[in-house]
């Protein structure tokens, strides 16, 4: 069972008085419609809240929105609707907040049907002031900031024009027509696809991929017969139609599209899809859909070039293009990912990898837990995590799994202890070691959030009834206290805390309902007096990540190195603080064959760690090539796993093979590429 609440186990002294002094209520003088909340900048305390209310009338919709601003993490709000001339803001575009601490905000307004273009409100001072700007186009998408320069914006228009601004939306220029999809790359580069004939839909598979590195002064066509493209880490991917049939294949570039290589991945047909599940500068996880309407596919992991792929996980649950997958990057521990597979019996099971997709296993059954009523064997089962798919299926799961890079090792998720994901009401489980071991944290579904880099975990029960109680833990979810934050319960709609889990403030959002009206209300609770002193060196203890067997000399080695972290002691009730930096010490491990993947033309037979040369593929050439780089087509059969830092130990040396004569590909070659200028 879950740890008791308000038991002696982890009691914080006088917490009720301390929290009561730091609980701030704000009632919003609005009719209840929808509310959206955005944090402006990091550690600024600035929150923007947009409330919108729609009334569908016979011929048109009456809409009203209000804008509120807080600069103290939500304790107090000021109505600033007059700064945007009481204009109705379009919620589907949200609030476009500038990268990092630029202080920039763009709001897109609703304009009447006959107008020449849309209207935006711009702020570059953390929403203290706004400038109204009329656009020469109607936006189709939210304004997109260049990651490198927040003055550079791009947007697509309803007429498929690509528009760019170089002065934070003051002036706009249409740099290209007939654009389907546009994305910022690195160094203020823009990648986009264009259609030649009818429309994006009609030309799917016949699109061109273009690049501009100077905000539209000049262009280069970097791909033809494009179905779609994506960016992940340092990789640019394009799915390209084959010459002979309706299949398509992934091609990859690591030089912004100047040269391409065909990825060693299966081709897909019209009804199938590729999806980049995760990518960093080292490698990529790619999902390849199975033929037919199966709802699953295969995960492949790439080498450092994004070209050679190893099969990582079969029967990976991914319902449809843009549908649901439970694939989750556990950001609190390097190399850990969780996802779901669809078993042969159509049950959904959770799998976890600790080594970036090298091996997947079931989650360990939590200590002192029993398999639920759906399990065939009451003693043999595992923990199955509820994520996006369960939420989409309207199971009683209010939140997806949660982890934070600065709360080392902590993962919180709803789960079932069973043979598979169960329709029974889930409980909340916590892992403090990145997913190796789990403990029931709270009985029944809850909303949860991490504060102060893991120093506090806050939770609210998921209930259809009004609530007035919040739970918190100062020892990584082992012991819980409950605090009644208001006498009058509210209909709870959400928990909000500043992204990054460094804050000590939590906002509880909801509405009150009376006979005639309902109003938005927020309660912001500051936990600073619960953690009344700053943590010192003695409050931390040393922890070895990925430890599974201390008797193994290489215990903790993952991707060629092990890491020791300073972690807050469970019994320390102190503030990590906003400036907390995770202290870690890496040490390099000796290489083993596990640190290498099989290079192109090689594979690992089942239960063998050696890479052996593939048979001649029944007389067929290998569909693979590095354009303009044929001299690199040599291999000894092994390639270090991306991000692996091992040294010494096993060094798989063997005769270097020349792959040139096996090399074929059907993607556009350099002569098909051309440059254009405006």
């Amino acid at each position: 069972s879950a740890p008791g609440e308000d038991e002696e186990c982890g009691r914080v002294r006088d917490f009720v008085a301390k929290l009561a002094n730091n609980t701030h209520q704000h009632v919003f003088d609005d009719l209840r419609g929808s509310v959206s909340l955005s944090w402006v900048g990091d550690s600024t305390g600035v929150i923007l809240v947009l409330t919108t209310f729609h009334v569908p009338l016979v011929i048109m919709t009456f809409g009203q929105s209000k804008l509120y601003r807080s600069e103290d993490y939500g304790k107090n709000f000021k109505d600033i609707t007059d700064l945007i001339n009481n204009t109705f803001i379009r919620t589907e575009f949200g609030m476009a907040i500038g990268p990092e601490n630029s202080g920039k905000v763009v709001l897109t307004a609703e304009v009447s049907g006959g107008s020449r273009g849309g209207r935006i409100f711009r702020s570059s001072d953390f929403a203290k002031n706004f400038v109204q700007t009329d656009l020469p186009f109607h936006p189709l998408t939210q304004m997109m900031y260049s990651p490198q320069n927040s003055d550079y914006l791009l947007a697509l228009s309803t007429e498929n024009g690509l528009w760019v601004s170089k002065n934070f939306g003051g002036k706009w220029e249409e740099i290209h027509k007939a654009v389907c999809l546009a994305k910022w790359g690195s160094d203020n580069t823009i990648f986009f696809t264009t259609y030649a004939n009818g429309s994006c839909k009609a030309d799917l598979g016949a699109l061109e991929l273009w690049r501009t590195s100077d905000l539209g002064k000049s262009f280069k066509t970097i791909g033809v017969k494009i179905y779609s493209f994506g960016l992940g880490g340092r990789f640019l991917f394009a799915s390209v139609m084959a010459d002979k049939d309706t299949t398509r294949r992934i091609h990859v570039s690591t030089d912004q599209g100047d040269t391409w290589s065909m990825a060693q991945l299966p081709s897909v047909g019209q009804e199938q899809f590729y999806s980049i599940l995760a990518a960093n500068d080292d490698m990529v996880f790619m999902h390849v859909d199975e033929p037919g309407d199966t709802g699953f596919g295969t995960i492949f992991t790439s080498d450092d070039r994004g070209i050679v792929y190893s099969k990582s996980l079969d029967r990976h649950l991914y319902t449809t293009t843009g549908g649901e997958t439970d694939f989750t990057n556990v950001t609190s521990l390097r190399g850990v990912y969780i996802t779901s597979v669809l078993s042969e019996d159509n049950s959904i099971q959770t799998m976890i990898t600790f080594d970036q997709g090298g091996r997947w296993t079931h989650l360990r059954k939590p200590e002192n837990s029993e398999c639920d009523a759906t399990a065939k064997n009451k003693n043999e089962c595992s923990l199955h995590i509820h994520a996006s798919y369960s939420i989409s299926q309207k199971l009683n799961v209010p939140m997806a799994p949660l982890s934070e890079p600065n709360a080392v090792g902590i993962v919180i998720a709803h789960g079932s202890v069973a043979d598979a994901i169960s329709v029974m009401v889930p409980d909340v489980y916590i892992s403090d070691d990145g997913g190796y071991s789990w403990t029931k944290m709270l009985e029944g579904p809850h909303y949860y959030t991490i504060l102060d880099s893991g120093g506090i975990i806050v939770a609210i029960e998921h209930s259809s009834r009004p609530i007035n109680v919040i739970k918190f833990s100062t020892d990584e979810g082992q012991c819980w206290q409950t605090y009644t934050f208001t006498r009058d319960p509210i209909y709870f709609t959400g928990l909000a805390s500043e992204p990054g889990a460094r804050s000590m403030n939590i906002s509880i959002w909801g509405f009150t309902e009376s006979f005639l009206t309902s109003q938005w209300v927020s309660y912001t609770i500051d936990f600073k007096d619960i953690l009344e002193r700053n943590c010192e060196e003695k409050d931390y203890t040393i922890w070895l990540a990925h430890s599974t067997d201390p008797e193994d000399y290489e215990d903790g080695c993952i991707l060629g190195y092990k890491e020791q972290f300073l972690r807050l002691r469970k019994s320390s009730v102190c503030q990590n603080g906003r400036d907390y930096v995770v202290t870690k010490q890496p040490s390099i491990c000796l290489c083993s064959l596990e640190d290498f993947l099989c290079d192109f033309g090689y594979y690992r037979p089942e239960n063998d760690s050696k890479c052996v040369e593939q048979p001649e593929l029944k007389g067929h050439d290998l569909e693979f090539c590095l354009y303009g780089r044929e001299e690199h087509l040599t291999t000894n059969g092994y390639r270090k796993i991306p991000g692996d830092k091992c040294q010494g130990g096993v060094n798989p040396v063997r005769e270097v093979k020349d792959l040139k004569k096996k090399c074929t590909s059907n993607f556009l070659s350099p002569e098909k590429q051309n440059s254009k200028s405006n």
């Epitope: 071991s437 203890t541 040393i542 990925h546």
Partner: antibody, heavy 124, light 106 residues
């Protein structure tokens, strides 16, 4: 079977230093923390500090901070405890002990293997 | 640092008795508590870790319970070999020991 073998008894003058060694055999020394615990005659156990051989991370009890230095030599699987500015009340049996480990936490699971103890007598 | 208070300091019992020793922490230590047995002239021996987990090779008559600040070591039926001094130790970070409980023959 893991064993910890400590250096022999020492007699020291007040104000001097003593360095006690603890050699591990039969296990993976580098993966466990080594703690040093002392016991004055007729008294209870007192933790002085510990070290993790990988990375050499040492931590000390507040009482001994500045007077004790704990080190480890991975190549010889040996841990050392040096106590300086000795006084008569430092007369005790000094034990090294391996911290048991079931997870990545080095200090949470008690001390499962102990050395035989080294008697240090401080007398003028 | 966390203080550990052990009681009683001395306990007289006979073979076959059920013996209970308690240990109180000055603040919550969750389950991070160990129990040791020490005989004169010998090094301590680990009996229990994580408040209630029995170390391998330790007889099952020894058991531990508790969490937070209150912990108990129980010997269900005292054997001749069990007359010794017992120490509790909190294991969360900077380690501290209780003062010890001497179990002697009645």
């Amino acid at each position: 079977q893991v064993q910890l073998v400590q250096s022999g008894a020492e007699v020291k003058k007040p104000g001097s230093s003593v360095k006690v060694s603890c050699k591990a055999s039969g296990g993976t020394f580098r993966n466990y923390a080594i703690s040093w615990v002392r016991q004055a005659p007729g008294q209870g156990l007192e933790w002085m500090g510990g070290i993790i051989p990988i990375g050499g991370w040492a931590n000390y009890a507040q009482k001994f901070q500045g007077r004790v230095t704990i080190t480890a030599d991975e190549s010889t699987s040996t841990a050392y405890m040096e106590l300086s500015s000795l006084r008569s009340e430092d007369t005790a049996v000094y034990y090294c002990a391996r911290q048991g480990r079931k997870t990545g936490y080095y200090y949470y699971y008690g001390m499962d293997v102990w050395g035989q103890g080294t008697t240090v007598t401080v007398s003028s | 640092d966390i203080q550990m208070t052990q009681s009683p300091s001395t306990l007289s019992a006979s073979v076959g008795d059920r013996v209970t020793i308690t240990c109180r922490a000055s603040q919550s230590i969750s389950s991070w508590l160990a129990w040791y047995q020490q005989k004169p002239g010998k090094a301590p021996k680990l009996l229990i870790y994580k408040a209630s987990s029995l170390e391998s090779g330790v007889p099952s008559r020894f058991s531990g319970s508790g969490s937070g600040t209150e912990f108990t070591l129980t010997i269900s039926s005292l054997q001749p070999d069990d007359f010794a001094t017992y120490y509790c130790q909190q294991a969360d970070g900077h380690i501290t020991f209780g003062g010890g409980t001497k179990v002697e023959i009645k």
